[in-house]
């Protein structure tokens, strides 16, 4: 019986530790996509609707803020699309890019952690164009550090929650 009690306490401890593990999955807020044809910061994301969730991390001013030191897996998926019903592309040669950036407040600095993308030729003869970028990586992050997303050509972003999103989850503590 003692062993069973110990075991259940162990399960509870493990479960509460897992529940305390920080994670975030943020989806694009389609009503507030910025304009611009160059690199712009995406600051409007959902954290509590549809697929979007956050726990033991903070979303503020367009940035995902780390609350616990640790090693985190960061990921971002950005979809670009254009359909001729919305008009024509003013240029057919496009650079479609995403940048995942870490900003440190304590020592004011900014680093690009990941970038992805391609130059594309989207011919005006085609009715529909689509391009998807997925980046992911394992990073040591400290409490207070902020993660943000920048993209090129935001007017071409796919606004669906399954298309444009980013997130993070803690994998382990820093030894």
């Amino acid at each position: 019986e003692k062993a069973m009690v110990d075991g259940s306490w162990l399960d509870l401890a493990k479960r509460s530790k897992l529940e305390a593990q920080p994670f975030a999955h943020l989806t694009i807020n389609a009503t507030d996509i910025p304009s611009g044809s160059h690199k712009v910061s995406l600051s409007s994301w959902y954290h509590d609707r549809g697929w979007a969730k956050i726990s033991n991390m903070t979303f503020s001013n367009g940035k995902l803020i780390v609350n616990q030191d640790g090693f985190y897996y960061l990921y971002a998926n950005i979809c670009f699309r254009h359909h001729e019903t919305s008009g024509d592309l003013a240029t057919e040669y496009l650079q479609l890019m995403v940048y995942v950036t870490k900003t440190s407040i304590k020592i004011p600095s900014s680093h690009t952690l990941m970038k992805g993308g391609s130059t594309k030729y989207w011919s005006g003869n085609s009715e529909f164009h689509f391009y998807s970028i997925n980046v992911g990586g394992f990073f040591k992050l400290r409490s207070g550090e902020e993660i943000s997303i920048e993209v090129s050509n935001p007017s071409l972003l796919d606004p669906d929650q399954d298309a444009t999103y980013f997130g993070a989850f803690k994998v382990r503590d820093i030894d």
Epitope: T85, S86, L89, T91
Partner: antibody
């Protein structure tokens, strides 16, 4: 205020060419596209083509491909539309119109024509 | 190629009447639909863009609605200065026009 002022009426013989100008003022000419639209007597409006005034890119209706040239002079904030090998069916009022989409804010030419020129009557008659 | 069809081709109404013009697209165009007013000898005027957004400076008696393939332009209270031909437009395609006259 935004204004598009077009050149005056023209009369041409069949087979000739005509060049219509459209002078823009009141906004940054390079940040917008200019479209050309015509209306023949008793007919609906007909889109002919556009020019991105910033980079000079153009797109034309299949109907006019090979007969139309659209250019721009950014220093003079003026767009030009030349139509060649004129026939009597080309008798129409030709309009220039500004696309509402600011190219600094995005790269989609939206086809919302927010300002128009007063029109230029081109008569093709032998 | 998308074809835009307007109805009626002409109408006659009294001052103060509510006037409705319909525009149909040959396939779904979401809300990418604009309305223009044309008066002889004058520059065309954008009234409504994006199916229902009123262009600045246009009187509030003009309104637009619809999405997909069916759209309407409504003049809630016809005024003498509204005598004109009205066109719907999606990108490169225009409707054939509706001529509005006063009874």
């Amino acid at each position: 205020q935004v204004q598009l002022v077009q050149s005056g009426a023209e009369v041409r013989k069949p087979g000739a060419s005509v060049k219509v100008s459209c002078k823009a003022s009141g906004y940054d000419f390079s940040n917008y596209a200019i479209h050309w639209v015509r209306q023949a007597p008793g007919q609906r409006l007909e889109w002919m083509g556009w020019i991105n005034a910033g980079n000079g890119n153009t797109k034309f209706s299949q109907k006019f491909q090979g007969r139309i040239t659209v250019t721009r002079d950014t220093a003079a904030s003026t767009a030009y539309m030349e139509l060649r090998s004129l026939r009597s069916e080309d008798t129409a009022v030709y309009y220039c119109a500004r696309d509402s989409a600011n190219m600094v804010r995005g790269i989609i030419i939206a086809y919302y024509f927010d300002y128009w020129g007063q029109g230029t009557l081109v008569t093709v008659s032998s | 190629e998308i074809v835009m069809t307007q109805s009626p081709s002409s109408l006659s109404a009294s001052v103060g009447d509510r006037v409705t013009i319909t525009c149909r697209a040959s396939q779904s165009i979401s809300r990418y639909l604009n309305w223009y007013q044309l008066k002889p000898g004058k520059a065309p005027r954008l009234l409504i863009y994006g199916a229902s957004s009123l262009q600045s400076g246009v009187p509030s008696r003009f309104s637009g609605s619809g999405s997909g393939a069916e759209f309407t332009l409504t003049i809630s209270s016809l005024q003498p200065e509204d005598i004109a031909t009205y066109y719907c437009q999606h990108t490169r395609a225009f409707g054939q026009g509706t001529k509005v006259e006063i009874k």
